[in-house]
């Protein structure tokens, strides 16, 4: 049973490693909220599906952040 | 390199508390999850506790009410009170895999070699 | 809490020979959340699989998860002498964290 009820954060471990952006499925980035006081980023990756927590703080991740949305950029008409 | 090391364990009186502690090592401690887990003598693995990489939030057995965790010390703690006959074991503590979530579980990919615990009159 | 099974309590095997290590679970686990681990003698436990199928780093070949649902099992597909050890899952899918309770692969 969680200590606190109220808090719903989802990632247990961070992971400050880089992600190669043509791996990625999808990229979720969570804002704070009165349910997770932090911001929290969620990669899907392509193999397997699997969930990874990424480190918000990492400049690595920051990098990601930036190649995805200039990428999304990309493709908007 | 990558290293946990416990300490805190030994012989004590049932009623009595304990604070078990876990040194991390070589990783960026404040990035991960951690865990307790103990084992009896001749018996299984038990699953403790686990506190989240910022310490917010905190999962339990039955057994144990006191995982805690201070970042600035890179330690992981394990306050044992009311200790009885049956709290006597081996207590590792253990990393949680990098990235892991409530959708995703990487397993605990670092362990420490366990710190032993006798609870006796 | 979730239960989980493993059979068989003992294994015998030769080196050489196909492991097939089965664990169940008492109410459905995410295939994300199973993991499985080998402890030796005097050690500490060690990482093989997480995600029901994912080896571990550094975790050889010859090591391999599959399942889902309730029904998972660990395979050892030629055994090596290293390899005689317990053997436990432990699902993630809900607190409190269980493992199973061991299979022993014994040397025959």
């Known amino acids: 049973v969680p200590l606190s009820r109220t808090v719903r954060c989802t990632c247990i471990s961070i992971s400050n490693q880089p992600v190669n952006p043509r791996s990625l499925e999808k990229l979720e980035i969570i804002p704070a909220s009165q349910f997770c006081p932090r911001v929290e980023i969620i990669a899907t990756m392509k193999k397997k599906g699997e969930k990874r927590c990424l480190n918000p703080e990492s400049k690595a991740i920051k990098n990601l952040l930036k190649a995805v949305s200039k990428e999304r950029s990309k493709r908007s008409p | 390199q990558v290293q946990l090391v416990e300490s805190g364990g030994g012989v004590v009186q049932p009623g009595r508390s304990l604070r078990l502690s876990c040194a991390a090592s070589?990783?960026?401690?404040?990035?991960?999850?951690m865990h307790w887990v103990r084992q009896a003598p001749g018996k299984g693995l038990e699953w403790v506790a686990v506190?989240?990489?910022?310490?917010s939030i905190k999962y339990y057995a039955d057994s144990v009410k006191g995982i805690s965790r201070d970042n600035s010390k890179n330690t992981l703690y394990l306050q044992m009170n009311s200790l009885r006959a049956e709290d006597t074991a081996v207590y590792y503590c253990?990393?949680?895999?990098?990235?892991?979530?409530?959708?995703?579980?990487?397993?605990?990919?670092?362990w420490g070699q366990g710190t032993t615990v006798t609870v006796s009159s | 809490e979730i239960v989980l099974t493993q059979s068989p309590g003992t294994l015998s095997l030769s080196p050489g020979e196909r492991a097939t290590l089965s664990c169940r679970a008492s109410?459905?686990?995410?295939?994300?959340?199973l993991a499985w681990y080998q402890q030796k003698p005097g050690q500490a436990p060690r990482l093989l699989i997480y995600?029901?199928?994912s080896r571990a780093t550094g975790i050889p070949g010859r090591f391999s998860g599959s399942g889902s649902g309730t029904d998972f099992t660990l395979t050892i597909s030629r055994l090596e002498p290293e390899d005689f050890a317990v053997y436990y899952c432990?699902?993630?899918?809900?607190?409190?964290?269980?493992f199973g309770q061991g299979t022993k692969l014994e040397i025959k």
């Open positions: 506190i989240w990489f910022e310490g």
């Open positions: 432990q699902q993630y899918g809900s607190s409190p964290y269980t």
């Open positions: 253990a990393r949680e895999g990098a990235g892991s979530s409530l959708y995703y579980y990487y397993g605990m990919d670092v």
């Open positions: 109410q459905s686990v995410s295939s994300g959340h």
């Open positions: 995600g029901a199928s």
């Open positions: 070589g990783f960026t401690f404040s990035s991960y999850g």
